[in-house]
């Protein structure tokens, strides 16, 4: 019962998390104009992974897509890639976990197969969550770097009288959505992995018993061939799971002086 609850909860948490990752990826407010120097601006700028927008005080909003692919900063492309990989892995994980749910019966699927699928989906959720967290964190780091650079160059005097205020950008709502969603997906994945341990049946360790018949000296193990091959109708095999170690190449980023719009 506890295993079913853990698996179900893990699925629901991951589902919410992946929905959040998708929402964050689609949101336009990854970076928003910093209003510290001008809290009553009549023009408000914000940017997403796919387009940049300007909301006027009049209520008119205009968004322009980044129609170039090669002209965009590598870091932005990396963030896009991480978020898409996170969504794809999460979606596959959700699909696998639906069939792995203990409360859903599909044909004569054995518990061992369900356990295997639960672990697979759990690992996928963990990697998906990590991708989202990494993507959002890379973007946040990019913002912090650009923020302090533009702060240093904030006011450039023109003829000593005219001021040109450089627009600074700070964390947008999408970053927080992404961090929370990534965390939820990660937690959901861990819960699925925990549930998998409960789903995987314990193998009964039968001790080899020697029967001494008169005139014969034959020793055998109960179950015979069936027990060793696992082809018998009522046999259950113990699986050995290897999570594997994943290493990701580190991409060194050089702070860009300019925003990507």
């Amino acid at each position: 019962m506890a295993v079913t609850a853990c698996q179900g909860l893990g699925f629901v948490v991951s589902l919410i998390g992946i929905a959040g990752i998708i929402a964050a990826t689609c949101m336009d407010q990854w970076s928003t104009q910093d209003l510290y120097n001008n809290p009553v601006t009549a023009v408000f700028n914000y940017q997403g992974l796919w387009r940049s927008c300007v909301r006027e005080s009049s209520g008119f909003t205009e968004c322009r897509g980044y129609f170039t692919l090669l002209g965009l900063p590598a870091m932005l492309q990396a963030v896009r890639a991480l978020m898409i990989v996170g969504i794809v892995l999460g979606a596959i994980g959700l699909l696998v976990s639906i069939f792995a749910l203990k409360c859903i019966r599909i044909g004569s699927m054995e518990d061992s197969a369900k356990a295997n699928m639960t672990l697979t989906s759990g690992i996928m959720f963990i990697v998906s969550g990590l991708c989202a967290i990494a993507g959002v964190s890379v973007f946040a780091n990019m913002l912090v770097t650009n923020f302090w650079m533009s702060t240093a160059n904030m006011y450039t005097g023109m003829g000593g009288m005219v001021q040109t205020v450089q627009t600074r950008y700070t964390f947008g709502a999408a970053l927080f959505v992404g961090w929370v969603a990534g965390g939820l997906t990660l937690i959901g994945g861990v819960m699925m992995c925990i549930a998998c341990r409960g789903l995987a049946p314990e193998e009964t360790n039968y001790k080899a018993v020697s029967y001494h018949a008169s005139g014969h000296s034959v020793a055998y193990k109960p179950g015979g061939f069936k027990a060793s091959t696992g082809f018998g109708s009522n046999t259950k095999n113990k699986k050995i799971y290897d999570g594997g170690a994943r290493t990701e190449d580190e991409v060194q980023s050089y702070p860009s002086k300019h925003d990507y719009v």
Partner: antibody
Framework: EVQLVNSGGGLVKPGGSRKLSCAAS????????MHWVRQAPEKGLEWVAY????????YYADTMKGRFTISRDNAKNTLFLQMTSLRSEDTAMYYC???????????WGQGTSVTVSS | DIVMTQSPSSLTVTAGEKVTMSCKSS????????????LTWYQQKPGQPPKLLIY???TRESGVPDRFTGSGSGTDFTLTISSVQAEDLTVYYC?????????FGAGTKLELK
Amino acid sequence: EVQLVNSGGGLVKPGGSRKLSCAASGFTFSDYGMHWVRQAPEKGLEWVAYISSGSSTIYYADTMKGRFTISRDNAKNTLFLQMTSLRSEDTAMYYCARFVRGNSMDYWGQGTSVTVSS
Amino acid sequence: DIVMTQSPSSLTVTAGEKVTMSCKSSQSLLNSGNQKNYLTWYQQKPGQPPKLLIYWASTRESGVPDRFTGSGSGTDFTLTISSVQAEDLTVYYCQNAYSYPLTFGAGTKLELK
């Protein structure tokens, strides 16, 4: 046809109060931010206050802050400007205007004259 | 606050002449997000409310004759009337539409020579 009709002006004593109205018609009033702009006799235009479509954002000119209150009734398609502690320098023609793209004001009321004098 | 400075304060012209008036802002009105300049031009005839001519520094409002042209970027802006008509002889105001408080220039008055 878009129309903005100003009313409520008149002669007021210094320190007195007045409430100006702006009745809108010919457009969906609740979709637009609105402004009050004034013009002293033989002088230029001076922005007074702004209110967003849903009244969530309100801005005032520094000289009007604390004395003037902008409000709107979307059900009645009406914009208001409550003026208190009036001074002689508040004597002007008061216009309401509709706020549109480019943060520009495309339609203006005909104006209502407020004279502050003892 | 952004200070708007219009020059000249008055201009004497003849009908059919090309007229140029200037508007300078104390801060850049160029928005980096959409590369648009938030400057608006209005025309005001005596006894009438102002009329919108140009927004985003160069976008003509619908119904405005094409003899009116707005140009400029950052802090320096210009309103040009290619061939002045009798009905154009009035006052023109520029306005900062970038930051609150919204500020107007003192105006340029066109007068007949």
